[in-house]
């Protein structure tokens, strides 16, 4: 008789990244009695929901339901009917929906309450859906990357199994950029974190881990571009906006009401004279640079340093792993090669800004015009950010490493969010035989 | 606006192969998944398949599996659908068309103008 | 797979005159999707989710349902609303279809 193979004692678990400019859901799986082990967990499937954000539809809440569709349909056909039930499903909404909550609590909670009952109509194990705080997006993207990286084992190897694996348990900060926050966590060395709202401690794994972290709301790419046009459209003359971070002859009307839209656009608000104005580019990576500068308060620090806007930053240590939109961005730019200098990076970007707007249509014919135009804010946004708001340098640019995957699994938050919400970060070093869950972060 | 082009008829033999395409543009191609949609002379619409553009995944009625394939070149915004073994029955208008949320969460829906393939001998 | 049956399979009906069209799914569905089609021409989406008019559609046309059963009316018909409707569902794999109503003139 032949051997039949054993069922996988496998387990899953989804987690639903709500962004601010779209939702991808995560499909998790992992071995049943290795819950406690470390790098056990990997992704099977990303989905990404077809659409905009959530927020984006505070007008029309009964329409979410259709809006997740497709991608609850593919979880359902990725995992195996008889795990169904016990298949844990988290949805996670990040700054677009903190912007949201600013502006009216009560929307939000509109918005999340549908968002709940949809997801209940699946056969799954619905934990629910909240908005998670900047911090917490901040700690579960570091955990993540670290996790994935197998910076939590405490079995040295003389071999390297994963990319960027430097041999030392020394863990990597996390960079993440979002479309309205942008994150920054790391731990720094033998330095007192001077702000509590930006210190994390952990327990994992039997060691011990004092964090920095920061969420700057209002700091990702497309929040910092609204930010930008507000703030540049109060000293232009007329309703033209000569605008250094967009493409020579590319032209784009703007509604005054859209730009005014944002919480993130409040403090550049101004009555106009005008009901929209029109951007033209000029395509000057310098000029660029210099005008998102001006997004960045550097003239009061309370504290031995700052990043910018008075938050506390201490002095950078280790390799950083920038993913998220850092990673699609400069993906896009073909700059994310370990051996591009940062000087490399700067000329390059000087040289994409400066190409005609019609030359960059034609290149890239398959890409939509809005997200093509935004490249060269966005890359000159990331320099920016890094160099002079969280103060990498020439030679520290090198410890930075745009990571899309890490072993198969994308990097950002939802791993770590899932991997402590289903108990699977054991505080203590775990026996060979598992222990009961006793303390987790 | 979002434009879906596909290629000219097809008269094709019983038992032989055909590959018709949908050209895409005014959207980023990943965006969102191409559909296949057929009908038979007089007859109603049936779901043949989808791509999803981001992903490579596809998903097919069980009825084509196997004897339709869906693929995409996205250096060329192009989606194909490849038909084998070709029988009379499979005459039809066949028709790529995309479905969802733009960026200010209004639904659309849009389709190609159709390609006849016509199976005769 | 879901099953969607429309009833009728056609019928006339003279301008002016009010009209309805139903669609009984095998299993329940989230929402329900109406496409107008013409000889010759693409399917038009009219109405979706099941009660939404898509975009260009006049408001005589209205939408409802829930569960298994979803209806699409027209209040007062037009000579341009002579056409085939199909419904569809798009809430689980495989996508599937009515097999239309045709609305006649009388």
């Known amino acids: 008789t032949q051997n039949k193979a054993l069922p996988e004692n496998v387990k899953y678990g989804i987690v639903l990244d709500a962004g601010s400019s779209h939702t991808s859901l995560y499909i998790y799986k992992w071995p049943a009695e290795k819950e406690n082990d470390t790098g056990v967990v990997h992704q099977v499937e990303e989905c990404r929901v077809k659409g905009p954000g959530i927020s984006k539809f505070v007008q029309k809440v009964n329409e979410i339901g259709i809006y997740l569709t497709d991608c609850m349909e593919r979880a359902r056909e990725v995992i195996p009917r008889s795990q169904h039930q016990e298949t844990p499903v988290y949805l996670g909404a990040t700054a677009g929906m903190r912007l949201l909550r600013m502006e009216s609590e009560e929307l939000a909670d509109r918005v999340l309450d549908v968002v709940e009952r949809s997801l209940s109509n699946y056969p799954f194990d619905f934990q629910g859906a909240r908005i998670i705080t900047g911090q917490e997006e901040g700690a579960y993207g570091w955990i993540t990357i670290n996790y994935l990286l197998g910076k939590f084992s405490q079995k040295t190897r003389w071999f390297s199994i994963v990319p960027y694996e430097t041999n030392n348990q020394e863990t990597f900060g996390a960079l993440d950029l979002g479309g309205a926050s942008t994150q920054v966590t790391f731990v720094p060395q033998n330095q007192t974190i001077e702000s509590p709202d930006n210190a994390l401690q952990f327990r994992l794994y039997g060691k011990d881990y004092n964090v920095y972290t920061h969420s700057f709301l209002c700091y990702g790419k497309d929040q910092a571009l609204w930010q930008k046009l507000a703030k540049d459209i109060q000293v232009a003359s007329n309703e033209i906006l000569r605008d250094p971070c967009f493409h020579p002859g590319y032209k784009k009307v703007v509604n005054v009401s859209d730009l005014y839209k944002t919480p993130c656009t409040k403090r550049f608000e101004m009555t106009l004279p005008f009901q929209q104005f029109e951007i033209q580019g000029i395509g000057n990576y310098q000029q660029c640079h210099q005008s998102i500068l001006e997004l960045f308060n550097t003239s009061y620090c309370p504290y031995s340093q700052c990043a910018f806007n008075g938050i506390f930053l201490p002095p950078l240590q280790g390799d950083f792993g920038a993913f998220s939109a850092f990673y699609f961005v400069m993906k896009f730019l073909n700059l994310t090669s370990e051996k591009v200098s940062q000087e490399k990076v700067t000329e390059m970007m000087k040289k994409f800004c400066a190409q005609p707007w019609e030359e960059i249509k034609t290149s890239y014919a398959g890409v939509k015009e809005k997200y093509l135009s935004e490249y060269c804010f966005s890359g000159t946004y990331i320099l920016s950010l890094l160099l002079q708001g969280y103060h990498f340098t020439a030679d520290s640019w090198e410890h930075i490493h745009f990571i899309g995957k890490i072993q198969g699994s994308d990097a950002g938050w939802t791993l770590g969010y899932m991997l402590n919400l289903t108990n699977m970060i054991p505080a203590e070093q775990p026996l060979s035989t598992p222990l009961s869950h006793s303390t987790y972060v | 606006e979002v434009q879906l082009v596909q290629s000219g008829g097809e008269l094709v033999k019983p038992g032989a192969s055909v590959k018709i395409s949908c050209k895409v543009s005014g959207y980023s191609f990943t965006d969102y998944n191409l559909n296949w949609v057929r009908q038979a002379p007089g007859k109603g619409l049936e779901w043949v398949g989808n791509i999803d553009p981001y992903s490579g995944g596809t998903r097919y009625n069980q009825k084509f599996k196997g004897r339709f394939t869906i693929t995409i070149d996205q250096s060329k915004n192009t989606a194909y659908m490849q038909l084998n073994s070709l029988r009379s029955e499979d005459t039809a208008v066949y028709y790529c068309?995309?479905?969802?949320?733009?960026?200010?969460?209004?639904?659309?829906?849009?389709w190609g103008q159709g390609t006849l393939v016509t199976v005769s001998s | 797979e879901i099953v969607l049956t429309q009833s009728p399979a056609s019928l006339s009906a003279s301008p002016g005159e009010r009209v309805t069209i139903s669609c009984s799914a095998s299993s329940s569905v989230s929402y329900m999707h109406w496409f107008q089609q013409k000889p010759g021409q693409a399917p038009k989406l009219w109405i979706y989710a099941t009660s939404n008019l898509a975009s260009g559609v006049p408001a005589r046309f209205s939408g409802s349902g829930s569960g298994t059963d979803y209806t699409l009316t027209i209040s007062s018909m037009e000579p341009e609303d002579f056409a085939t409707y199909y419904c569809q569902q798009r809430s689980s794999y495989p996508l599937t279809f009515g097999q239309g109503t045709k609305v006649e003139i009388k």
């Open positions: 068309g995309l479905y969802g949320y733009d960026d200010d969460a209004n639904y659309f829906d849009d």
